[in-house]
Interface confidence: low
């Protein structure tokens, strides 16, 4: 804490400008008001603070709101949004969607802090919902905030959002999530020649349905091995043998490593074994030939 | 050009199910998401219930629920909604309708089927 | 659970300009589809996503979205767009209608 020392003559400030930043901390807390601080944040992230400046201007700030800031300082931070803890931010009451961009450009290529992960959620709790500007604004700063999202709140993510989107940060979604991103994904990316659509859409098979598995699987595509095991195994099961192949080229080979593991166990199990023996990798478990296979997945959706 | 085809015209007596089929023709729609909704004689549109692509996932309106079932028949393109314990109230034309080409964002219906006239009635 | 409020007719004559409104608790936060229906049809979407227009759908066909209000502009109305539209959004994983507005064109 900054020792409460009195202004020395003519130092009083009388605006927020560059002359303060040869101020020292002590100066700083002893010279600069607090109200005309809060009035003029807008200008503190023009000038250039050192860091332990604005400690000693955050510290000013928390002693005059120790409630929390209201919007229209939270609004003008800047660069000392940065300074703020999650304790600090869960004081606040923010509702404005600008004050959010405003915070999280402060934060942008950065990876989600704890402080813009609060703020967030204080955000989203303070409107009530998670309307469709938000969701645009959060995916545009953080394509890794969809996994974050309930299936039913990613409903409302635009396609456009999708693009955004790197392989890395679908990594913490599960399938239900997948199962609604996928779609979106394949209508923003509709418009892509037959390779360049594979790398956009890659991260989001795992909620590809069959229909488009075979589809892509007439399409020279070469899925890697991991690709295909975040399949959706119900989307995998009614492959083909031959399907499956031309869906990983020369990958085809890596279904022997992973024989045990799904989906490409429950996979193996649906085939009739002359089919596996074609491949040549010496899969085992696939249906004895003059066995009889009964299609029961219609039942089984009915029961 | 893609068509919803649905089942015909059916007469139930109260207590009763219905199962309304709707079925795609001209292209294969286990991508899209699939709605039910439904028209009383004069009256307005009411949403039932929406069935995603895998037919793994649905949701209902709150007042079908434990009334309604939508399911999903990948290799024929169809898509069924059973609605039981019916009543004279739910005399409807029921509609299927397809989120397609204008996003799945917030899934508008672009494409419905021509209806299916549910008649309860002792 | 969501309510939208419809007014139930318009009334424009050829040529004029036809504004159907459809009202609920902050609807400008939610996307508004719009939907035209003529007697023994089936709908037609006409707007989805406050403010675009499917393929197939004439430019005089346009909508808005903001505050309370989805609004649905019809310019140079013709005769053929006599009709019922009905409005729509997403609130809280369901799909609300609104009752309806009949379009008659004088």
């Known amino acids: 804490e900054v020792e409460k020392t009195a202004c020395p003559s003519g130092k009083k400030a009388r605006e927020i400008d560059e002359s303060l930043i040869f101020y020292k901390k002590w100066e700083l807390e002893a010279c600069v008001d607090a109200a005309l601080l809060a009035t003029q944040m807008d200008r503190v992230n023009a000038i250039p603070f050192t860091y332990e400046q604005l400690d000693v201007l955050k510290h000013k700030l928390d002693e005059l709101y120790p409630q929390g800031y209201p919007e229209s300082v939270i609004q003008h931070l800047g660069y000392l949004f940065l300074k703020m803890s999650p304790e600090d931010i869960r004081k606040w009451n923010v509702t404005s969607l600008e004050t959010l961009k405003a915070l999280l450009e402060v934060n942008k290529g950065h990876e989600m802090s704890p402080q813009v992960a609060t703020l967030i959620d204080r955000f989203v709790k303070g409107r009530g919902q998670l309307d469709k500007d938000t969701l645009d604004t959060l995916t545009a700063f953080y394509p890794g905030y969809l996994c974050s999202l309930s299936p039913e709140e990613l409903s409302s993510v635009p396609p456009s959002s999708i693009w955004a989107v790197r392989p890395q940060d679908l990594d913490t979604c599960d399938p239900r999530q997948l199962d609604v991103l996928y779609p979106k994904a394949r209508l923003a990316f509709q418009n892509m020649n037959g390779s360049e659509y594979f790398v956009k859409i890659q991260s989001f098979l795992g909620g590809a349905p069959t229909e488009d598995l075979k589809a892509l699987s007439q399409q020279n595509v070469s899925m890697d091995l991991a690709t295909f095991m975040k399949l959706r195994t119900d989307a995998v099961l009614p492959l083909t043998v031959a399907e499956v192949q031309k869906l990983l080229g020369p990958h085809v080979e890596g279904l022997k490593a992973e024989e045990r593991h799904r989906p490409v166990r429950d996979w193996i199990l649906r085939q009739r074994q002359d089919d596996l023996d074609t491949l040549g990798l010496g899969l085992q478990g696939g249906i004895p030939n003059g066995y009889l296979v009964l299609d029961l997945s219609m039942q089984e959706a009915l029961s | 050009e893609v068509q919803l085809v649905q089942s015909g015209a059916e007469v139930k007596e109260p207590g009763a199910s219905v199962k309304v089929s709707c079925k795609a023709s001209g292209d294969t729609f286990n991508r899209y998401y699939v709605h039910w909704a439904r028209q009383a004689p004069g009256q307005g549109l009411e949403w039932m219930g929406i069935i995603n692509p895998s037919g793994v996932s649905t949701t209902y309106a709150q007042k079908f629920q434990g009334r309604v079932t939508m399911t999903r028949d990948t290799p024929t393109n169809t898509v069924y909604m059973e609605l039981g314990s019916l009543r004279p109230e739910d005399t409807a034309v029921y509609f299927c309708a397809e989120s397609r080409g204008s996003g799945y964002n917030y899934f508008a219906m672009d494409v419905w089927g021509q209806g299916t006239l549910v008649t309860v009635s002792s | 659970s969501y309510e939208l409020t419809q007014p139930p007719s318009v009334s424009v004559s050829p040529g004029q300009t036809a504004d159907i409104t459809c009202s609920g608790d902050k609807l400008g936060d939610k996307y508004a589809s719009w939907y035209q229906q003529k007697p023994g049809q089936s709908p037609v979407l006409v707007i989805y996503q406050d403010n675009r227009r499917p393929s197939g759908i004439p430019e005089r066909f346009s909508g808005s979205n903001s505050g309370n209000t989805a609004t649905l502009t019809i310019s140079g109305t013709q005769a053929m767009d006599e009709a019922d539209y009905y409005c729509?959004?997403?609130?809280?994983?369901?799909?609300?209608f609104g009752p309806g507005t009949k379009v008659t064109v004088l």
């Open positions: 729509q959004a997403w609130d809280s994983d369901t799909y609300v």
